[in-house]
Every structure is written in structure tokens, then in C-alpha cells.
């Protein structure tokens, strides 16, 4: 997260880290005791999933292996349309005050809505600085029409933009797949942005979760 702040401890109990060995690979969101929602471009053969801590590599955090993941069938590596994936944990999460599932959206929030995005991604760009603490940024949803003025053909129909005018605050490498939460519901998954990160007036781009609720529910049901 560029130009963010340290999240209030325990305020994101649904936030997970997808690790490759001991290294951060992506963020993710707990949606069920067996399931984590993340970005399709985060796909690996297997995952170590850290839950229940704001510190990356916390020895006291829950760590669960995951060997199965289900990308949206319409995902494109080139355009990043349908950049959403479900990761099935090999064993169920132990729920607690530190580990909770996020609330999936009942509706799509409108432009102007205040939201918070979080992650352990680099806080500087192009030179990288990875924080140990979970970082947050407060952003507002931007209309598709406004966002298309910036990104034109790069912006797909189920992509959601968020940012703050003239501000550098944004997501960056390592934040991918993490949550954009608005009014206590998951509205976005970190998908992409421009590089180097933190270009003013280049919104962060997210997968618009409200458009995928049916796919999420059906996929979890199919692979119970």
C-alpha cells in the first residue's frame, strides 16, 4: 500500500496472506471456514495461508496449507478480466475474534462510497519496501465512466476503480487479491494498477465482487 497507514490491530479479521514458502505472494479474504477469495493472477500450485494476525510471518498466527484453487473460467492473463479465484483450505479455519469471514455484498456500492483497502504489499515503488504490519488506505469508489477516461480499453465491465483525486495512495505489488471493504462488505479484490505505483489520478483497479457472488457461491457448493 502506497501512502497508507498501519491498520488498527484486529480490524481486518478476514484478511489473509497467501505465502509462497515464507514469502508474501498475495493477499486474500476469508469468505468461509474452508474458502479464501483472491485474484486469479495469484494462482500457484499450492499455498501457505496465514490467518488471524496483522503481522506477516507471525509465529502465533494460524497457518493452513491449501492445494486446490479454482480460477474463474473466464479469466484472461492478458486483460485481467474475471480476475477472481477461490482457494480451498486443506482443513477448516478455527474461527475467533481474530479470524472471521467477510460479509459478501448484497448489492454493488455506488461511486463516491468510502472504502478501505488493505495489504502487506510494498509501501514504496519502484524500489520496494515490504512492511511487516498490515497497511490500510482509505479510498473512494470511482464511476466506470470516470475511470475509463484514464484507462480506456484496459478497463473491463466487471472492474471497479477506487482512489483519491491527486493523491498517491494506492495498492502495489503484494497487495493483489486483498480486500476492498465498503460499508462492512467486500466490494473489491485488488487486481491491478499502473507501475510504478502511486501515480496521482491513476485509480487502483479491483475485481468487482458484487458481480461474482453467484459464481462464488456455486463454486464453493460444487467443491464442498
Amino acid at each position: 500500500i502506497i501512502d497508507g497507514y498501519k491498520c488498527k490491530e484486529g480490524s481486518h479479521p478476514w484478511q489473509v496472506a497467501l505465502l509462497k514458502g515464507n514469502q508474501l505472494h498475495c493477499g486474500g479474504v476469508l469468505v468461509d471456514k474452508y474458502w479464501v477469495l483472491t485474484a486469479a493472477h495469484c494462482k500457484m500450485g499450492q499455498y501457505q495461508v496465514q490467518l488471524g494476525s496483522d503481522k506477516i510471518g507471525d509465529q502465533s498466527a494460524q497457518k493452513i496449507k491449501a492445494t486446490k484453487s479454482f480460477r474463474h473460467p473466464g479469466y484472461s492473463t492478458k486483460t485481467h478480466v474475471n480476475d477472481i479465484m477461490l482457494v480451498r483450505l486443506d482443513e477448516p479455519v478455527k474461527m475467533s475474534s481474530k479470524v472471521e469471514a467477510v460479509q459478501l455484498p448484497e448489492h454493488c456500492e455506488p461511486p463516491g462510497t468510502s472504502c478501505t483497502v488493505s495489504g502487506w504489499g510494498t509501501t514504496t515503488s519502484p524500489d520496494v519496501t515490504f512492511p511487516s504490519d498490515l497497511m490500510c488506505s482509505d479510498v473512494k469508489l470511482i464511476s466506470s465512466r470516470e475511470c475509463k477516461k484514464v484507462y480506456k480499453d484496459l478497463l473491463g465491465k466487471t472492474m471497479l476503480c477506487a482512489g483519491i483525486p491527486d493523491s498517491k495512495t494506492n495498492t502495489c505489488n503484494g497487495d493483489s487479491g486483498g480486500p476492498l471493504v465498503c460499508n462492512d462488505t467486500l466490494q473489491g479484490l485488488v487486481s491491478w494498477g499502473t507501475y510504478p505505483c502511486g501515480q496521482p489520478n491513476d485509480p487502483g483497479v479491483y475485481t468487482q465482487v458484487c458481480k461474482y457472488k453467484r459464481w462464488v457461491m456455486e463454486t464453493m457448493k460444487t467443491h464442498r
Epitope: H41, H80, L154, G193, P200
Partner: antibody, heavy 122, light 107 residues
């Protein structure tokens, strides 16, 4: 279809400033996510990245050339330019302008100009 | 700067042969690795992006693999029109850097 075209003098005298312009057609230089680069290739050699400019005017230069390079953009003309000062014979090369899709997820040069040979000689 | 070491610098193969080029990065670049083809007197052309993704319109005989520091580019069945110099390029960190190139010739 995006097209890039380099223009400028093919011969520059030592110690002078090399100036090239790249004209972009079929796409807007103001589009977010696309950066505009200069790359050069010495005769019979490999590719050397010089630097880029973004729609906002944000630039980044190769540290090895930084003290001599200036890249600027003119969005109204859909052009960007390279200036390389205090040139020597070692700056003789084919100069390419290129567009890069530059996102957190992937970044690559997808469109290139045809290149222009600049010879530094008195 | 990240150094990109490409090998071999040149190779000669017969039409129909499988050709393999390797590229090694001086540090971990994840999958931010692209491959370009350059024919004499022409600009480079993107073939593979993100280490393994084939650019639209590029023949499927071209492929790429690898992650981290070690990458491979393969032409499964060399064709006469593949005579060119091939370059790898890292896009993980600035400044972007290229390998030294591999000149592919027909025996």
C-alpha cells in the same frame, strides 16, 4: 493499431545535443497504464533502455545516462521527445521509441517505432 | 541494476529442430520476463510476456517458461522465417534491462 514514428537529424556533431521526436498515431499518449520509452541499439550490439515518460510528465531514466537525458511529452501533439546532451561517438546507435503496457501485474513493450540511426561525427 | 545473462550468444540449427535459449537474472524477478524477436534492420517484436504467455498472433511453436531467476525460451520446430536475434528483458525493476541476445541461424 498503434504506430510510432521517430524523427530527427541522422547526424550530430560531438559535444552537441541529440534531439529526437516520436509521433504516436492510433492511440492516445494520455492513456493510463501506457508508458512511452526510448531504447537504443549500438551497431551490431544489444538493446539499451534509456528511459520513459508517462502521461503525467513523470520520467525515469537509466542511471547510466541520467545526467545527459531529458524526455518530454506534448500531449496536444501526441508526441514525446528525447534529448541527449554532450554526445560522443559512443552515442552512435539506432534509437527506438516504444510503448510499454506497465501495470503491477505485467509490463512489456508492445509497440515499437521502426528506429532511426543517429551517427555522431564531426 | 539487474543483469540478464542470455545463452548461447549464437546457435545454428536445422529446419524442424527444437531450439532452446536460456536467460538468467542476477536476482529474483518473479515472472516479469519478456522475450522479443528482432530481424535484421527491424524493430524488436514481442513474442512472450510474463515468462510464459504467448502474445496475440504469435505462432504456437514459440513458448517460454521459468520463474525467479531462470528462464527458458523454446522454438519447438525451427522455421526459415525464425532466423533472427532473440532477446530476453526483465521488467521487475527499473531500469529495465535486456539480455545480450541470441542469434539464431539455419544450418
Amino acid at each position: 493499431q498503434v504506430q510510432l514514428q521517430e524523427s530527427g537529424p541522422g547526424l550530430v556533431k560531438p559535444s552537441q545535443t541529440l534531439s529526437l521526436t516520436c509521433t504516436v498515431s492510433g492511440g492516445s499518449i494520455s492513456s493510463g497504464g501506457y508508458y512511452w520509452h526510448w531504447i537504443r541499439q549500438h551497431p551490431g550490439k544489444g538493446l539499451e533502455w534509456i528511459g520513459y515518460i508517462y502521461r503525467s510528465g513523470y520520467t525515469y531514466y537509466n542511471p547510466s545516462l541520467k545526467s545527459r537525458v531529458t524526455i518530454s511529452v506534448d500531449t496536444s501533439k501526441n508526441q514525446f521527445s528525447l534529448k541527449l546532451s554532450s554526445v560522443t561517438a559512443a552515442d552512435t546507435a539506432v534509437y527506438y521509441c516504444a510503448r510499454a503496457k506497465q501495470l503491477t501485474t505485467h509490463r512489456y513493450f508492445d509497440y515499437w517505432g521502426q528506429g532511426t540511426l543517429v551517427t555522431v561525427s564531426s | 541494476d539487474i543483469q540478464m545473462t542470455q545463452s548461447p550468444s549464437s546457435l545454428s540449427a536445422s529446419v524442424g529442430d527444437r531450439v532452446t535459449i536460456t536467460c538468467q537474472a542476477s536476482q529474483d524477478i518473479a515472472n516479469y520476463l519478456n522475450w522479443y524477436q528482432q530481424k535484421p534492420g527491424k524493430a524488436p517484436k514481442l513474442l512472450i510476456y510474463d515468462a510464459s504467455n504467448l502474445e496475440t498472433g504469435v505462432p504456437s511453436r514459440f513458448s517460454g517458461s521459468g520463474s525467479g531467476t531462470d528462464f527458458t525460451f523454446t522454438i519447438s520446430s525451427l522455421q526459415p522465417e525464425d532466423i533472427a536475434t532473440y532477446y530476453c528483458q526483465q521488467a521487475s525493476d527499473l531500469p529495465f534491462t535486456f539480455g545480450g541476445g541470441t542469434k539464431v541461424e539455419i544450418k
